[in-house]
């Protein structure tokens, strides 16, 4: 009797089970009683990442320069083309459709991890003890000077966002 | 239901070319499937002559040693067979067929 | 070309007995998917014939399930569990994995 189910990598038609055709292949006609599923390759622009008993191919990403993006990885018959973003700028969401500046840390903020193209810049306030005095994509909030190390005493505190200031050592008893 | 009906001459003359039209109904020759020509001498067993595919592509059988065509008019559903240079081995019932569904077959004899 | 060879070429038996006719290819009938394009065919004088096993095993539909086949490679079997008065007839293997499509030369099936 006909089958009801099919095997892994088959699907069911007209009481045949069909073999499913392999990444980076489309569907021509379904098997028959007679015939085997027909399939054929995607052209150089299109892809099937599975098997499948799709009809057309999906089209390669297109990375828009307009839109910041470039060719990370090109695409096959089975992958999709893979953007990222130019120099300074990253990905907006997980499927990287645009790219937006990467944003700078503010004073009183340091660079935890640089950007990527697929990641924006991660900021954390300066602790005690560091500051930041710049807004920069790229530098980490940096230590208070040691006074002492220089035989100097601290004149002005340090904050998060600015150093400490350091004086010669009151010479009088 | 699938249907197929052969039309074409009963008598066709040595060295003339038979020709034969098998009407399809019930489902477009188009669509999938392999539309086959066999034929039966009488008395005989049976004999695959060729195919036409529902892309249009054919494949025939070598021992009939290119005498034989397979078309369609898919504007009327129908595929046909030309087979030339008759002799009097060619005399059979030929029938066209899906291979699940067939035509209730037509007799050509050849002779003069 | 697939040869087939058919056996018995005929066979005469009664209602009720269980019958086995065998078909032969002389190459594999197995794709390269691990298909097998192997079927059987029932013909009854002046008619067409029609299928009754496709791709080895499967039942077309409408046919009795007394009617089976099986096999794999180059050796396969129809088998009739229990005769029935309809079922003495000529039967015929065909193969369609490889062009050209080749039938056995028939097993006659008739009445002791």
């Known amino acids: 009797e006909p089958p009801t189910a099919c095997r892994e990598k088959q699907y069911l038609i007209n009481s045949q089970c069909c073999s499913l055709c392999q990444p980076g292949q489309k569907l021509v006609s379904d098997c028959t009683e007679f015939t085997e599923t027909e399939c054929l390759p995607c052209s150089e622009s299109e892809f099937l990442d599975t098997w499948n008993r799709e009809t057309r191919c999906h089209q390669h990403k297109y990375c828009d320069p307009n839109l910041g993006l470039q060719v990370q990885q090109k695409g096959t018959s089975e992958t999709d083309t893979i953007c990222t973003c130019e120099e300074g700028l990253h990905c907006t969401s997980e499927s990287c459709e645009s790219c937006v500046p990467h944003r700078s840390c503010l004073p009183g903020f340091g660079v935890k991890q640089i950007a990527t193209g697929v990641s924006d810049t991660i900021c954390e306030p300066c602790p005690v003890g560091f500051f930041s005095n710049v807004s920069s994509a790229f530098e980490k909030c940096r230590p208070w000077t040691s006074c002492e190390t220089k035989d100097l005493v601290v004149q002005q505190a340090g904050t998060n966002k600015t150093d400490v200031v350091c004086g010669p050592q009151d010479r009088q008893r | 239901e699938v249907q197929l009906q052969e039309s074409g001459p009963g008598l066709v003359k040595p060295s003339e070319t038979l020709s034969l039209t098998c009407t399809v109904s019930g489902y477009s020759i188009t669509s999938n499937y392999y539309w086959n020509w066999i034929r039966q001498p009488p008395g005989k067993g049976l004999e695959w002559m060729g195919y036409i595919r529902y892309d249009g592509s054919n494949n025939y059988n070598p021992s009939l040693k290119n005498r034989v065509t397979i078309s369609r008019d898919t504007s009327k559903n129908q595929f046909s067979l030309k087979l030339s240079s008759v002799t009097a081995a060619d005399t059979a019932v030929y029938y066209c067929?899906?291979?699940?569904?067939w035509g209730q077959g037509t007799t050509v004899t050849v002779s003069s | 070309d697939a040869q087939m060879t058919q056996s018995p070429s005929s066979l005469s038996a009664s209602v009720g007995d269980r019958v086995t006719i065998t078909c032969r290819s002389s190459q594999s009938l197995e794709n390269t998917n691990g298909n097998t394009f192997l079927n059987w065919f029932q013909q009854k004088p002046g008619k067409a014939p029609k299928l009754l096993i496709y791709?080895?095993?499967n039942r077309f539909s409408g046919v009795p399930s007394r009617f089976s086949g099986s096999g794999s490679g180059t050796d396969f079997t129809l088998t009739i569990s229990s005769l029935q008065p309809e079922d003495f007839a000529t039967y015929y293997c065909l193969q369609v994995t490889h062009v050209p499509f080749t039938f056995g030369q028939g097993t006659k099936l008739e009445i002791k």
């Open positions: 791709r080895v095993s």
């Open positions: 067929a899906r291979l699940d569904y």
